[in-house]
């Protein structure tokens, strides 16, 4: 191709190749991308005495591993292996929070309820939270202009495999009842291309779960619909149930009073409807 | 492995102390949390503070601040400087730490505050 | 900070016997609670941590359950040795804002006969 020929012309090094970074669609790698997960490691294994046995630095280089050097729409989850076995972690059964379109109050509820996990409660999923980041082909650089976007570019980019496998891993290992948070607000609730939709439904495991619960979170104070009999959240209670795992359902009409009540359940206002 | 605070005594009401805990048969150098609570005579047991040694942040009661500053002065030894003495701080100090729980417990210094 | 509720305050119970001892927290701790046992004279040692996960060398005749709010410390067989003061312990943390705090229950005096 031209671009060959220019290269050949130009006796260009593969690893001088930043100065002609592929343009892709999506924002670049977060700035300051090494220190911010390096950092978030050592906090979180502060804060959680049962994760000190992991070497942040070790983590780092796994998570490093996985896409520098690579093309980064070639990406697979076999490339994050190695991080996602430093990031072991298990989850009590019962205690597995599932969210699709609804992640702030997924997260809300866990900060109160501490005994329940969502998947940015464990050492991986908080390490690359709201995180974005790319390297390139055949040099040790991260790309901060630009990174691929899932939709215009490629599904094969670090971040969405990233999600991918740690998202896999976090339904594969959950137990007993698991709980998803669904926004009711949205014209899919049950979004089949949500990551919920397409990887961790169908990769809980029903020798060991037991039943899905879904909390369908209302958006409006006056909504007193019954947002379980939408025919999205009827498409969900058909593939769980195939799947040979019980589906129950749960309007959660006013989602501050029921955060509220997760922080003072004895307080009498909980003993009505949330 | 072990710990062993040192520094308790005899002091008037508002005077300053500085206990001091040492580690023996294992360092501070990766990350564990070394902390020092008290038990006042025939009362429970009372949380002061800790300290990350692997980061050196530093957590107190909400009582504890103000009065009371925990440090790490070397890969071994954790201190906890006391000012302001009242007789209510008259107990029995002791470190705890470990790199999960509080696991490890040094046997204690009496700390009296009388005049 | 959290407040621990510990009861009862004292318990007496038989040789071979069962003790239950209940420990609350003011907020969702999770799993983190230890249970300790104190002699008079000596220093508290640990039994329990992380709400049901027996310490080295800790008899199996000591059970932690629990979580959230809600824990229990259970001694069965009792044996006179069992004679101590035992407390609950609780660790919390928050992310964001960089705190982390412990707290003790009040203690309970169990009493062998």
């Known amino acids: 191709s031209g671009l060959n020929d220019i290269f050949e012309a130009q006796k260009i090094e593969w690893h001088e190749l930043p100065r002609w970074r592929q343009q892709w669609s999506g924002s670049g790698t977060t700035s300051r991308f090494p220190e911010t997960v390096l950092a978030r490691c050592v906090k979180y294994t502060e804060v959680h005495p049962e994760m000190r046995h992991v070497d942040c630095q070790s983590v780092w280089d796994a998570f490093k591993g996985a896409f520098i050097s690579k093309y980064p729409c070639n990406i697979t989850e076999e490339d994050y292996q190695p991080l996602v076995k430093l990031g072991t972690q298990t989850v009590p059964c019962n205690k597995t929070l599932l969210w699709s379109r609804i992640k702030d109050l997924a997260h809300q509820f866990t900060q109160v309820q501490r005994d329940m996990f969502t998947l940015e409660d464990m050492l991986l999923g908080y390490l690359a939270d709201d995180l974005t980041w790319c390297g390139e082909f055949n040099t040790f650089e991260i790309n901060y202009q630009s990174c691929p976007d899932w939709r215009k570019d490629c599904s094969n980019n670090p971040v969405s495999v990233f999600w991918k496998t740690v998202s896999r891993r976090f339904a594969e290992t959950a137990c007993g009842v698991v709980h998803v948070m669904l926004n009711g607000s949205r014209s899919k609730i049950f979004d089949k291309n949500s990551t919920f939709g397409s990887v961790e439904v169908h990769n809980l495991q029903p020798e060991k779960v037991q039943a899905l619960e879904a909390w369908v979170i209302h958006g409006g104070r006056e909504d007193s619909r019954d947002l379980c009999q939408d025919p999205t959240i009827k498409e969900l209670e058909s593939i769980i149930s195939k799947r040979n795992i019980r589906f129950f359902c749960k309007n959660i009409y006013r989602p501050d009073k029921f955060l509220q009540c997760v922080k003072n359940p004895e307080d009498s206002s909980c003993l009505s409807g949330i | 492995q072990s710990l062993e605070e040192s520094g308790g005594g005899l002091v008037k009401p508002g005077a300053s102390l500085t206990l001091t805990c040492k580690a023996s048969?294992?360092?501070?150098?990766?990350?564990?949390?070394m902390c020092w609570v008290r038990q006042a005579p025939g009362k429970g047991l009372e949380w002061i503070s800790c300290?990350?040694?692997?980061?050196?942040?530093t957590y107190y009661a909400n009582w504890a601040k103000g009065r009371f500053t925990i440090s790490r002065t070397s890969s071994t030894t954790v201190t906890l400087q006391m000012t302001s003495l009242t007789a209510a701080d008259t107990a029995t100090y002791f470190c705890?730490?470990?790199?999960?729980?509080?696991?490890?417990w040094g046997p204690g210094t009496l700390v009296t505050v009388s005049s | 900070d959290i407040v621990m509720t510990q009861t009862p305050s004292s318990v007496e119970a038989a040789v071979g016997g069962t003790v239950t001892i209940k420990c609350q927290a003011s907020?969702?701790?999770?799993?983190?609670l230890a249970w300790y046992q104190q002699k008079p004279g000596q220093p508290p040692k640990v039994l329990i941590y992380?709400?049901?996960t027996l310490a080295s060398g800790v008899p199996s005749r000591f059970k932690g359950s629990g979580s959230g709010t809600h824990f229990t410390l259970t001694i069965s067989d009792l044996e006179s040795a069992d004679a101590a003061t035992y407390y609950c312990?609780?660790?919390?943390?928050?992310?964001?804002?960089?705190?982390?705090?412990?707290?003790f229950g009040g203690g309970t005096e169990v009493v062998v006969k």
């Open positions: 705890a730490g470990d790199s999960d729980y509080l696991g490890l």
């Open positions: 048969g294992f360092s501070f150098s990766s990350g564990c949390d």
């Open positions: 300290i990350y040694t692997g980061s050196g942040s």
């Open positions: 907020q969702n701790i999770g799993n983190y």
């Open positions: 992380r709400a049901s």
């Open positions: 312990q609780s660790y919390y943390y928050t992310t964001d804002d960089n705190y982390r705090s412990w707290a």
